[in-house]
């Protein structure tokens, strides 16, 4: 299920001309969407333009993270009096245009959503032959994209004087609560975010000192659901195994 | 897995009413257009209507315009199509398909059909 | 309102090559899907966008779009491809969807 917000809707005005009454250059998208990992989701952007019955080459792009500087993720073409806008780049082959430009609509859709998604998008139309003109979303629309907790990697690791350590690491939005439970185990350890990976999607929680053998569990919630994942700890011989 | 499927087809009464429903599973039902198709027995594929991701836009072919109804609730993931004013010529097994593509895009998944037979 | 017209039989021969037209005015500058439809069974989609395929689709299954005709091309015929296969696009004067009439592919 997919949840549009429509909060604030840009119309920014950029250059007039010759049309009466003056039509502006504005775009029309909301603020956020929401939608979870693995489902699809769509991308509001209508736009006006001062070009009255424009029907020379058009080019709408869609970029991902910045305006104006921000790499291209979709971009199509549509020629002189075509209605086709015909796609020269989809990345990963998930993005999909659903308005029609000629019909001032550059709606996308993003299918096979993952947390690397979760960002903001700006559309921007580019008119060429006869009018050169163009015009980009300035704050564009955020996709926010939500995940159920999916543990990525749990371990057991050296630590200081013969001891061993655990770690384990989660991905998720909202992003998940870890806690450790095992042999002689309290509460476990509170979970510290990861150094900035996976767009602030990470988390990260350390078990410092692992004292007894048995076994170690790391449970990962969010308010989308939780998961656990385990370690084995046998010490002989100075040495260890986990699973 | 997308699945499409249908209910609500049977035999009617010339001048009759019918509704025919499409339950959608396995994607995002609110982020695509949906459509009907039917198939006259013996005959080939007939394009009826579409309804765009949000409900905003309905186009209809003119065999059918202002006596089908196609709408749907993305809240239950599922597509309509209210019959009205039903002729004989409406006799066919009809299909409820998914728009896989851009605006101007195809049919990527279909619903098993469903026979509409309208006679008196 | 675009129309499509496609002739209503081809015949080949396994293992030989199946071209199916489809005609219409400046077919060239829209998008053409191919539909096959078996007997008793929902169409499916067997190249979309002039040329691509979908994924479970043998490469057996081709498609060129120029001028005022669209073609799928099969190669090596099986006896399994023996259905009607349809074309289709998007009448952007309408916003409308427009199929052909069908062609039914027999193998011999």
């Known amino acids: 299920f997919v949840r549009t917000k429509i909060d604030t809707t840009e119309n920014l005005l950029n250059t007039e001309v010759h049309s009466s009454p003056v039509q502006r250059w504005s775009m029309q998208v909301p603020a956020e969407v929401s939608a979870a990992a693995g489902d699809a989701a769509v991308l509001p952007c209508t736009f006006t333009h001062p070009h009255r019955h424009y029907d020379g080459p058009l080019t709408a792009i869609w970029r991902a993270g910045e305006p104006y500087a921000g790499p291209q993720v979709f971009r199509c073409a549509a020629a002189r009096g075509s209605e086709l806008c015909q796609t020269a780049l989809s990345l990963h082959g998930r993005f999909r245009l659903l308005g029609n430009p000629r019909r001032n609509d550059l709606s996308l859709r993003v299918e096979r959503l993952a947390l690397a998604d979760d960002r903001r998008y700006f559309c921007r139309v580019e008119f060429a032959g006869d009018v050169h003109d163009r015009y980009e979303s300035r704050h564009g629309v955020r996709l926010h994209v939500t995940a159920a907790p999916r543990i990525i990697n749990i371990s057991v690791l050296p630590g200081p004087a013969h001891a061993f350590r655990a770690l384990c690491t989660t991905e998720g939005e909202p992003p998940p609560a870890l806690a450790w439970s095992g042999p002689a185990l309290g509460n476990g350890s509170a979970a510290v975010p990861s150094s900035g990976q996976g767009h602030g999607h990470l988390v990260t929680a350390e078990l410092p000192a692992l004292n007894h053998d048995g076994r170690y569990t790391c449970t990962a919630a969010n308010s989308l659901g939780r998961s656990e994942a385990s370690v084995y700890l046998f010490r002989f011989h100075g040495a260890s195994a986990s699973t | 897995q997308v699945q499409l499927v249908q209910s609500g087809g049977g035999v009617v009464q010339p001048g009759r009413s019918l509704r025919l429903s499409c339950a959608a599973s396995g994607f995002t039902f609110s982020s695509y257009a949906m459509h009907w198709v039917r198939q006259a027995p013996g005959k080939g594929l007939e394009w009826v209507a579409v309804?765009?991701?949000?409900?905003?836009?309905?186009y209809y072919a003119d065999s059918v315009k202002g006596r089908f109804t196609i709408s749907r609730d993305n809240s239950k993931n599922t597509l309509y199509l209210q019959m009205n004013s039903l002729r004989a010529e409406d006799t066919a097994v009809y299909y409820c398909?998914?728009?896989?593509?851009?605006?101007?895009?195809?049919?990527?998944?279909w619903g098993q059909g469903t026979l509409v037979t309208v006679s008196s | 309102q675009s129309v499509l017209t496609q002739p209503p039989s081809v015949s080949v021969a396994p293992g030989k090559t199946a071209r199916i037209t489809c005609g219409g005015n400046?077919?060239?500058?829209?998008?053409v899907h191919w539909y096959q439809q078996k007997p008793g069974q929902a169409p499916v989609l067997v190249i979309y966008?002039?040329?691509d395929r979908p994924s479970g689709i043998p490469e057996r299954f081709s498609g060129s779009n120029s001028g005022n005709t669209a073609t799928l091309t099969i190669s090596r015929v099986e006896a399994g491809d023996e259905a009607d296969y349809y074309c289709q696009v998007w009448d952007s004067s309408s916003d409308h969807r427009v199929f052909g009439g069908g062609t039914k592919l027999t193998v011999l």
């Open positions: 309804i765009s991701y949000d409900g905003s836009n309905k």
């Open positions: 400046n077919i060239g500058s829209k998008s």
């Open positions: 966008d002039d040329s």
């Open positions: 398909a998914r728009e896989g593509g851009s605006y101007y895009g195809y049919f990527d998944y």
